[in-house]
Interface confidence: medium
C-alpha cells in the first residue's frame, strides 16, 4: 500500500482553484488573477474569458469557474456559451448580410431573431384563411371551406416571394 501511495501523482491532490506548480516541487498554488481551474489536479489554470465590446459580463470569473458573457441590448447570443452576438432585428424582419430587411410578402417573423418563414398554407390542411398573415404574424387558419356558409371563399396565400427557385413576376 505504501508503494502505491508513493506512485500516486501528487498533483491529484490539488483542488479546483489551484494548479500543480512544477516550478515549486509540484505544490498546489492558487490560480493567478484572471485565471481559473474548474477541476482538481490541473497543471495550469485557464485564462478567464473577457466579455468585451458587444459582449457583457453575466457572471464574473472566479478561481474555480470561467466568466460567462451575454450580449448588450440590441443583440442576442448565438452558439454554445454565447460564442457570438448577433444583431436583433424588429419583428417582421430578418437579419441578412446587409443588415435587417423586411420579410418578403408571404413570409413572417414574430421574433427579433431568426429568419422570415412562409405563412402557413391553410389549404394543405383543407382549411381556409380566417385572418390574413402579415410580416409579423402567420395566417390564422379557420374551418374548411366546406364547413363555411354558402358563398364563403377560401383565400390561399401565394408562395413566399423569395423562396429559392420561385420567381415572382
Amino acid at each position: 500500500f505504501e508503494r502505491t501511495r508513493s506512485l500516486q501523482d501528487p498533483c491529484s491532490n490539488c483542488p479546483a482553484g489551484t494548479f500543480c506548480d512544477n516550478n515549486r516541487n509540484q505544490i498546489c498554488s492558487p490560480c493567478p488573477p484572471n485565471s481559473f481551474s474548474s477541476a482538481g489536479g490541473q497543471r495550469t489554470c485557464d485564462i478567464c474569458r473577457q466579455c468585451k465590446g458587444v459582449f457583457r459580463t453575466r457572471k464574473e470569473c472566479s478561481s474555480t469557474s470561467n466568466a460567462e458573457c451575454d450580449c448588450t441590448p440590441g443583440f442576442h447570443c448565438l452558439g454554445a456559451g454565447c460564442s457570438m452576438c448577433e444583431q436583433d432585428c424588429k419583428q417582421g424582419q430578418e437579419l441578412t448580410k446587409k443588415g435587417c430587411k423586411d420579410c418578403c410578402f408571404g413570409t413572417f417573423n414574430d421574433q427579433k431573431r431568426g429568419i422570415c418563414r412562409p405563412w402557413t398554407n391553410c389549404s394543405l390542411d383543407g382549411k381556409s384563411v380566417l385572418v390574413n398573415g402579415t410580416k409579423e404574424r402567420d395566417v390564422v387558419c379557420g374551418p374548411s371551406p366546406a364547413d363555411l356558409s354558402p358563398g364563403a371563399s377560401s383565400v390561399t396565400p401565394p408562395a413566399p416571394a423569395r423562396e429559392p427557385g420561385h420567381s415572382p413576376q
Epitope: L78, G79, S83, M84, E86, E94, T96, K97, K98, K101, G114, I115, A161, R162, E163, P164, G165, S167, P168, Q169
Partner: antibody, heavy 118, light 108 residues
C-alpha cells in the same frame, strides 16, 4: 423562366479595363439583390460583389475593392461590373447570380470568360 | 472572414453508394445562412440546399443537408450517374460571402 445572360468578357492586357453586363429576364429584376461570382480556371468559386435592389448599397471582396464597380439599371433589367486596373489573377469566368441574401444564389448565368494577359 | 473548409477534397464512389460531404466553418454560422451547390464541368453552379437543410425547388430528395454551428453535412443517399460533380458550401451570414474549396465526387 428566369434567365441571366452575361456578356462583355474577353482578352485584356494587365492594367486594362472591361465592362461586363448581365441581362435579366423572367422575374422582377428591381426586387432582388444581385451578385457577381467568379471562378478562376480549375479553381473554386469566389464571391466578387453584390448590389441591393435600388443600387444604393454595394459590397466588394477585398481582392477587387477600389478597382471594380458594380451597378444596375432597373429600367433595362441589366446588372453591370466595371473592371479597371485588371490583373492576371482576375482571369476567371464571371457569373452573375440572383442573390436571395439569407438563402444563397438561386439562379446563375452561364458565365463570361475574362482573360487578363499580355 | 469566415473560412469554410470542405472534406474530403475528392470522394471516389460508385453509383448507388451513399456520399457524405463535410463543410466546417472557422466560426459559428447560423444554419439559416448555409447553402450547398452542385457544379458540373462547363456549367454554372446550381443551388441544392439552403438554410443548411432545405432543398431548393426541383432538387431530388436523395439530397439532404444537416448541421449547425461550425459543422455542416451534405448527404446524397444513393448516387445517380448525374450526381458526379463538384459540390460547394457557401455562407451568407457575414461579409465577405465565402465558399468552401469544393469536394469532387467522382466515379470509382
Amino acid at each position: 423562366e428566369v434567365q441571366l445572360l452575361e456578356s462583355g468578357g474577353g482578352l485584356v492586357q494587365p492594367g486594362g479595363s472591361l465592362r461586363l453586363s448581365c441581362a435579366a429576364s423572367g422575374f422582377t429584376f428591381s426586387s432582388y439583390d444581385m451578385s457577381w461570382v467568379r471562378q478562376a480556371p480549375g479553381k473554386g468559386l469566389e464571391w466578387v460583389s453584390d448590389i441591393d435592389p435600388t443600387g444604393s448599397k454595394t459590397d466588394y471582396a477585398d481582392s477587387v475593392k477600389g478597382r471594380f464597380t458594380i451597378s444596375r439599371d432597373n429600367s433595362k433589367n441589366t446588372l453591370y461590373l466595371q473592371m479597371n486596373s485588371l490583373r492576371a489573377e482576375d482571369t476567371a469566368v464571371y457569373y452573375c447570380a440572383r442573390d436571395l441574401l439569407v438563402y444563397g444564389f438561386d439562379y446563375w448565368g452561364q458565365g463570361t470568360l475574362v482573360t487578363v494577359s499580355s | 472572414e469566415i473560412v469554410l473548409t470542405q472534406s474530403p477534397g475528392t470522394l471516389s464512389l460508385s453509383p448507388g453508394e451513399r456520399a457524405t460531404l463535410s463543410c466546417r466553418a472557422s466560426q459559428s454560422v447560423s444554419s439559416s445562412y448555409l447553402a450547398w451547390y452542385q457544379q458540373k464541368p462547363g456549367q454554372a453552379p446550381r443551388l441544392l440546399i439552403y438554410g443548411a437543410s432545405s432543398r431548393a425547388t426541383g432538387i431530388p430528395d436523395r439530397f439532404s443537408g444537416s448541421g449547425s454551428g461550425t459543422d455542416f453535412t451534405l448527404t446524397i443517399s444513393r448516387l445517380e450517374p448525374e450526381d458526379f460533380a463538384v459540390y460547394y458550401c457557401q455562407q451568407s451570414y457575414s461579409y465577405p460571402v465565402t465558399f468552401g474549396q469544393g469536394t469532387k465526387v467522382e466515379i470509382k
